[in-house]
């Protein structure tokens, strides 16, 4: 299973699409910055087995997919870019699911790291709460887009470490 290689390419494509999705000048949104508390420690550990690491990445992609699949998201972003982005994420999720099934046969470890997955879930809950509090304003979405780009970039470093471990 060569997930880290294929996922890294998919991650890069997703980042490019996210970068293209901007609709307003971010300079008008500085005062809307917010600390979402990205769970960095969940992407720092070397304690993960490959299947566990993939399940954490899977959760992050799944939550991102859910966030950008809402009707509020559809009302904000340019439809064709949003569709391409969702398709890219969906492809990554399918690749990961196939990879985890393959890896579980190799590893004698639990499939999921429950605490790490919960930390990722809570991170996205904070993002959703922020959007709700800001009434899904264009600037709130800009801040979230920037945050997701950052979290994708940070998870890319995690993936590269995972690939080096192989």
């Amino acid at each position: 299973c060569d997930l880290p290689q294929t996922h890294s390419l998919g991650n890069r494509r997703a980042l490019i699409l996210l970068a293209q999705m901007g609709r307003i000048s971010p300079f008008s949104c500085l005062k809307d910055r917010h600390d979402f508390g990205f769970p960095q420690e969940e992407f720092d550990g070397n304690q993960f087995q490959k299947a566990q690491a993939i399940s954490v990445l899977h959760e992050m992609i799944q939550q991102t997919f859910n966030l950008f699949s809402t009707k509020d998201s559809s009302a904000t972003w340019e439809q064709s870019l949003l569709e391409k982005f969702s398709t890219e994420l969906n492809q990554q999720l399918n690749d990961m699911e196939a990879c985890v099934i393959q890896e579980v046969g190799v590893e004698e470890t639990p499939l999921m790291n429950v605490d790490s997955i919960l930390a990722v879930k809570k991170y996205f809950q904070r993002i959703t709460l922020y959007l709700t509090e800001k009434k899904y304003s264009p600037c709130a979405w800009e801040v979230v887009r920037a945050e997701i780009m950052r979290s994708f970039s940070l998870s890319k470093i995690f993936q590269e470490r995972l690939r080096r471990k192989e």
Partner: antibody, heavy 121, light 107 residues
Framework: EVQLVQSGAEVKKPGESLKISCKGS????????IGWVRQMPGKGLEWMGI????????AYSPSFQGQVTISADKSISTAYLQWSSLKASDTAMYYC??????????????WGQGTLVTVSS | DIQMTQSPSSLSASVGDRVTITCRAS??????LNWYQQKPGKAPKLLIY???SLQSGVPSRFSGSGSGTDFTLTISSLQPEDFATYYC?????????FGQGTKVEIK
């Protein structure tokens, strides 16, 4: 290692044009904005403007709007500050610094070494 | 524009002293305030961001506090290398603005 390396000192005459540079390395250049800060001799820091290298969107301080132009070439990870017609009052040290944009991260955490611009007839 | 006013503009202190510099914004800036240290002939160095977060690699004797309009930078025990000029800067909205600076000199 994150670095911002600025071009060397310049001595110019009033009315001349000038373009100074700031090259980023050791990080994703398009993931951060680049700001420019002026420091006149013996004075404090003044924010001039900022650029998002990913799309070259800019914002200027009203004090510097129309006086300078900020640009970037993401293919070579370089930001620029330029004047079309220098004045003696442009004599100063100019710094570039990176900014995390809309992310909750330290502002202006890395700075260039500065470019001294001297304008004298 | 948001005006930033630092006080004092200069102060004399001895090694080991506790030093406090204040910064006031002309309107509420939440916690969007940074503190920088600058030594002669050098670029500024970030010390504190978002009012109270210590930048990586900065000694723990430096601390920041405040929110809204009033902010403080404290050096708990002044060291010889701390003699420099300190600037506050608001990052709440454009145009970004700096305080006029506080020069910390040896008594």
């Amino acid at each position: 290692e994150v670095q911002l390396v600025q071009s060397g000192a310049e001595v110019k005459k009033p009315g001349e044009s000038l373009k100074i540079s700031c090259k980023g390395s050791g990080y994703s250049f398009t993931s951060y904005w680049i700001g420019w800060v002026r420091q006149m001799p013996g004075k404090g820091l003044e924010w001039m403007g900022i650029i998002d290298p990913s799309d070259s969107d800019t914002a200027y301080s009203p004090s510097f709007q129309g006086q300078v132009t900020i640009s970037a070439d993401k293919s070579i990870s370089t930001a620029y500050l330029q004047w079309s017609s220098l004045k003696a009052s442009d004599t100063a040290m100019y710094y570039c610094a990176r900014h995390p944009g809309l992310n909750w991260a330290p502002d202006f955490d890395y700075w260039g070494q500065g470019t001294l611009v001297t304008v004298s007839s | 524009d948001i005006q930033m006013t630092q006080s004092p503009s200069s102060l004399s202190a001895s090694v080991g002293d506790r030093v406090t510099i204040t910064c006031r914004a002309s309107q509420s800036i939440d916690r969007a305030l940074n503190w920088y240290q600058q030594k002669p002939g050098k670029a500024p160095k970030l010390l504190i961001y978002f009012a109270s977060s210590l930048q990586s690699g900065v000694p723990s004797r430096f601390s920041g506090s405040g929110s809204g309009t009033d902010f403080t930078l404290t050096i708990s025990s002044l060291q010889p290398e701390d003699f420099a000029t300190y600037y506050c800067q608001q990052s709440f909205d454009f145009p970004l603005t700096f305080g006029q600076g506080t020069k910390v000199e040896i008594k």
